[in-house]
């Protein structure tokens, strides 16, 4: 029975050339988190594994940093980084929980953080 919910940073914006922290938090479940995947569309950015720690995909090594916590920091942002990002929590015994974040990378300096929201 999957009872948990994922809270994410929601819709966020950041400036080109800057950095942003993607954060998800799993609550309302006692399930054990065995691994968290960070994905952009169907591309794997990084993995945080309970046994092995962090693994950053080679193609993102220069611009992705692990943390804080189970979150992910994207650096040297470009407009091409605009899009959907997903945190996938692999848990036992519940299974898979997915959170969605939409990032907009702006040319100007008017970047603002969106409201937090929950995904059941």
């Amino acid at each position: 029975m999957m009872t948990g919910t994922i809270e994410t940073t929601g819709n966020i914006s950041a400036e080109k050339g800057g950095s942003i922290i993607l954060q998800c938090h799993l609550s309302s479940t006692t399930a054990q988190v065995t691994q968290v995947n960070w994905e952009q569309q169907d591309q794997l950015l990084a993995i945080c594994n309970a046994d092995l720690g962090w693994h950053i995909s080679p193609s993102f090594k220069d611009r992705v940093a692990p943390g804080p916590g189970l979150g992910l920091t994207l650096q040297s942002l470009t407009v091409n980084d605009t899009g959907e990002y997903f945190c996938i929590y692999h848990t036992y015994p519940d299974g898979t929980y997915t959170g969605r974040i939409f990032l907009e990378v702006l040319e100007s300096s008017v970047a603002e953080h969106g409201a937090r929201f929950q995904i059941p």
Epitope: N37, I47, A50, Y92, T96
Partner: antibody, heavy 119, light 107 residues
Framework: EVQLVESGGGLVKPGGSLKLSCAAS????????MSWVRQSPEKRLEWVAE????????YYPDTVTGRFTISRDNAKNTLYLEMSSLRSEDTAMYYC????????????WGQGTSVTVSS | DVQITQSPSYLAASPGETITINCRAS??????LAWYQEKPGKTNKLLIY???TLQSGIPSRFSGSGSGTDFTLTISSLEPEDFAMYYC?????????FGGGTKLEIK
């Protein structure tokens, strides 16, 4: 080339025990979670155990919890399945399989070892 | 547990044809369904995972679609080596569960 080779199967009486092994080669064994899956004589597949890359976490379905124990020796690149209190319904071909690094599905399987539980 | 119903259990087709195999989950499993091929004397092969992602090294004539409860494996322009047993498996929720299999034979 990734290779998984199971061994240790055989004929055992109900209530008996058996320990299966799976020798892994061609990849960094200690970086991957591993599973055991069995296939009944009727060709139905059933997942029976899983272990995390470092061996800290183990998972089982209710059908085998308390009777089966999955373990691994990363120094020997070997996965194990210890089975006790065996029942006739445990008769199957047992496969070890590697989980994808991203945890989505099992990307490599062994050829299997046969276990028959009968008096 | 999530029950997976796979259909048909048997399918006869000719090389060059396009076929589809379906799997239905007893509850939503998001996109988390995998497809495997089983052939005598060979180890099981992962074809598709996460519903539609093609495993590395698998020919593009294999494709997967669906989300929620209904999923489809499509094999277009069947090759002689495609005649085999196919299984789906949900990887959304423990315990991982499999469909009953589809035997694809040459007509």
């Amino acid at each position: 080339e990734v290779q998984l080779v199971e061994s240790g199967g055989g004929l055992v009486k109900p209530g008996g025990s058996l320990k299966l092994s799976c020798a892994a080669s061609g990849f960094t064994f200690s970086s991957y979670a591993m599973s055991w899956v069995r296939q009944s004589p009727e060709k139905r597949l059933e997942w029976v155990a899983e272990i995390s890359s470092g061996g800290s976490y183990t998972y089982y379905p209710d059908t085998v919890t308390g009777r089966f124990t999955i373990s691994r020796d990363n120094a020997k690149n070997t996965l194990y399945l210890e089975m006790s209190s065996l029942r006739s319904e445990d008769t199957a071909m047992y496969y070890c399989a590697r989980k994808r690094r991203d945890y989505y599905a099992m990307d490599y399987w062994g050829q299997g070892t046969s276990v028959t539980v009968s008096s | 547990d999530v029950q997976i119903t796979q259909s048909p259990s048997y399918l006869a087709a000719s090389p060059g044809e396009t076929i589809t195999i379906n799997c239905r989950a007893s509850k939503s499993i998001s996109k988390y369904l995998a497809w495997y091929q089983e052939k005598p004397g060979k180890t099981n092969k992962l074809l598709i995972y996460s519903g539609s992602t093609l495993q590395s090294g698998i020919p593009s004539r294999f494709s997967g679609s669906g989300s929620g409860t209904d999923f489809t494996l499509t094999i277009s322009s069947l090759e002689p080596e495609d005649f085999a047993m196919y299984y789906c498996q949900q990887h959304n929720e423990y315990p991982w569960t499999f469909g009953g299999g589809t035997k694809l034979e040459i007509k």
